[in-house]
């Protein structure tokens, strides 16, 4: 008799694919154009990242450090009307796109959560909770929460309301703390919170380091559902080179949990060089026209126009990784093993029931590596085959498709490696 | 109206470091940027950094390593700093506003300081 | 970066003659998405700071006087003025804002015959 599939896990819409980042609107769709109506005109191009959520804004009244001017039930009128924004949550929905509103109160600001006044604050978060999810918002946002007194407990009681009106709705909290015991403390008594932080922004970008941060992260949260991101609201860029860009692409769409990015790391978007560009929002590229101050400052290279007509752009790397993250089991709501493969690697599996295996080897350093995949660190459950197929690399060069021999596996310097291979019984 | 103003010692001592202060007028540095220019006697004109209007700081390559721009928005000044000063550094310097249309910087620069001159020299 | 090379370095002229200088940037500064060309001119009296006189390669800054003629391809740029005067007499600097860093030709020194 064939084995009994195992059940298949309760799977809410921000497990099956990538969050997407909008905080600027200005400078996602190019200065002079940054509104509702315009972003919009932008969802088809979300739509091709295969993202599943656009974490939008903030986009309220706020005026500066000011409590009594910042209203967080009406959009700022720069960015359009309550009938924009109605008319982009009904063609993001017919995208199968969900829409999260950032509303962190005082974003522009000195205090995310202005210094005083935490409960005047707090109420007016919860009467915005309410107003939005009836407008039919799919989730929210807070970001900052370092800022917020009793920040545990608010979340709690925010997650409550989210969660009352709606299994389906989400609550983000965004930190800028790294340290695994803040962290914890605060998803500690929120069960379904989905936290972003700067956890991993402190990898030192190795493949020890990264292992041993990820391996007790997922340890110390248990089974809980987690999010991965190197920040809670800045591009990659600002913590990596440009040669880990893709391999961070592929560890963080294949890591068991929700991947988050910010507008422009698909395309590996750097304010460092766009001079003059703020470096938490720079001006998206979409063509060599978007950064009209310093023309030479952008080549074809850096923008969508020229990396979507190049299948070895990073850009075509986030297309194809995002459509694996939302289609197969494994990396959908798979089991992850890491596993020792030797210094400045790492490497895990991703493995569901039946279901098609993932292996994914990343080399970390700026050597070429050997990898020695040591098999006995992994489970029964989990072994590997002496052969997997190359499903893709994040260097140009290797033939896809073809099998490799996991015991003479070689990496290229900073080389990510996303291997497949049947479940045997 | 808009007017810039370049202020700080004539004369310095080589390996010291030289602090300017350019004092503004007539417009925000929240929404402009301001270059430093120097001009050795005789000579022409070298760009030598900017800060720009969110406070990011660009330098010339060759002067990077010793070269500092910072700014105090409230009292409307921009500062430079370099240190590790030699002859070869005496000039007059100029501070200029960066070119801004409400949308984009351009990189031309509109107003000028009256410059001051410093001299390297033990 | 991109250099800026201007010619001749220093021209000795009469008052009422029509003069032209020029200056070429070792790569284009034509930008094709909105057709203009990122290159700035400045003068320079003795003993005064630069005044910027033209950008975008031909727009005169408002109070320059219309004998101030800019203009210019991708890498080779003029600067003419129709009838000089005794006041013009300065160092011409031409300036490229395409790439970044900013950079500067050396300079065309106009003198008295």
């Known amino acids: 008799r064939a084995p009994r599939c195992r059940e298949l896990p309760a799977q809410k819409w921000w497990h099956t694919g990538a969050l997407y980042r909008i905080g600027d609107l200005q400078a996602f769709q190019g200065h002079g154009a940054g509104n509702l109506a315009g972003l919009k005109g932008r969802l088809d191009y979300l739509s091709s990242l295969k993202v599943k959520g656009l974490v939008l804004g903030p986009i309220h009244k706020n005026q500066k450090d000011d409590v009594a001017q910042t209203d967080l039930l009406q959009i700022d009128p720069n960015f359009g009307s309550k009938e924009d924004f109605d008319s982009l949550l009904q063609s993001a929905k017919k995208k199968s796109i969900r829409v999260i509103l950032d509303l962190t109160p005082n974003y522009r600001g000195e205090n995310s959560w202005f210094s005083t006044q935490v409960d005047t604050v707090a109420t007016k978060v919860k009467d915005a909770l309410e107003f939005w999810l009836q407008a039919g918002v799919d989730g929210f946002q807070v970001r900052d929460i370092e800022n917020l007194k009793d920040a545990s407990s608010f979340l709690a009681e925010w997650q409550n309301i989210t969660k009352g009106f709606s299994e389906d709705r989400l609550l983000i909290a965004g930190t800028n703390s790294s340290d695994l015991q803040q962290i914890l403390s605060l998803l500690e008594s929120n069960k379904d919170l989905l936290l972003t932080s700067s956890y991993l922004s402190d990898s030192g970008s190795t493949g020890e380091h990264t292992k041993s941060l990820v391996t007790q992260y997922l340890n110390a949260t248990g089974n809980r559902w987690c999010s991965w991101s190197l920040s809670q609201a800045r591009l990659l860029t600002s913590f990596l080179p440009a040669q880990l860009l893709r391999l961070y692409q592929l560890m963080l769409f294949t890591l068991p949990g929700t991947p988050v990015f910010s507008y422009g790391d698909e395309i590996g978007l750097d304010a460092a060089a766009l001079p003059g560009q703020p470096m938490e929002a720079p001006v998206m590229l979409w063509d060599e026209s978007s950064f009209p101050d310093i023309p030479g400052a952008v080549s074809a290279n850096m923008t969508v126009k020229g990396q979507s007509e190049d299948p070895g752009s990073l850009l075509s790397l986030f297309r194809r990784l995002s459509d694996q993250r939302s289609k197969e089991r494994s990396l959908l709501h798979g089991d992850f093993h890491a596993f020792s493969a030797g210094p400045g690697l790492f490497s895990y599996i991703r493995h569901w029931d039946q279901n098609e295996r993932f292996l994914v080897v990343l080399n970390f350093g700026d050597v070429g590596l050997s990898a020695g995949l040591q098999a006995s660190d992994l489970p029964a459950s989990a072994s590997l085959p002496a052969k997997a197929d190359l499903l893709l690399s994040t260097q140009p060069g290797r033939e896809e498709g073809s099998p490799l021999e996991l015991e003479r596996l070689k990496l290229e310097p900073h080389e990510g490696l996303l291997l497949r291979f049947p479940y045997a019984a | 109206q808009v007017q810039l103003k370049e202020s700080g010692p004539g004369l310095v001592q080589p390996s010291q470091t030289l602090s300017l202060t350019c004092t503004v007028s007539g417009f925000s540095l929240s929404s402009y940027g301001v270059i430093w220019v120097r001009q050795p006697p005789g000579k022409g004109l070298e760009w030598m950094g900017i800060?720009?209007?969110?406070?990011?700081?660009n330098y010339n390559s060759a002067l990077k390593s010793r070269l500092s721009i910072s700014r105090d928005t409230s009292k409307s000044q921009v500062y430079l700093k370099m240190n590790s000063l030699q002859t070869e550094d005496t000039a007059t310097y100029y501070c200029?506003?960066?070119?801004?249309?409400?949308?984009?910087?351009?990189?031309?620069?509109?107003?000028w300081g009256q410059g001051v001159m410093v001299t390297v020299s033990s | 970066d991109t250099v800026m090379t201007q010619t001749p370095s220093s021209q000795a002229v009469s008052a009422g003659e029509k003069v032209t200088m020029s200056c070429k940037s070792s790569q284009s500064l034509l930008y094709s998405e909105n057709k203009k060309k990122y290159l700035a001119w400045y003068q320079q009296k003795p003993g005064q700071s630069p005044k910027l006189l033209i950008y975008w390669a031909s727009t005169r800054e408002s109070g320059v006087p219309d004998r101030f003629i800019g203009s210019g391809s991708g890498t080779d740029f003029t600067l003419t003025i129709s009838s000089v005067q005794a006041e013009d007499l300065a160092v011409y600097y031409c300036q490229q804002y395409y790439n970044f860093p900013y950079t500067f030709g050396a300079g065309t020194k106009l003198e008295l015959k």
């Open positions: 200029a506003r960066h070119y801004y249309d409400g949308t984009h910087y351009y990189g031309y620069f509109d107003y």
């Open positions: 800060i720009w209007a969110n406070g990011n700081t």
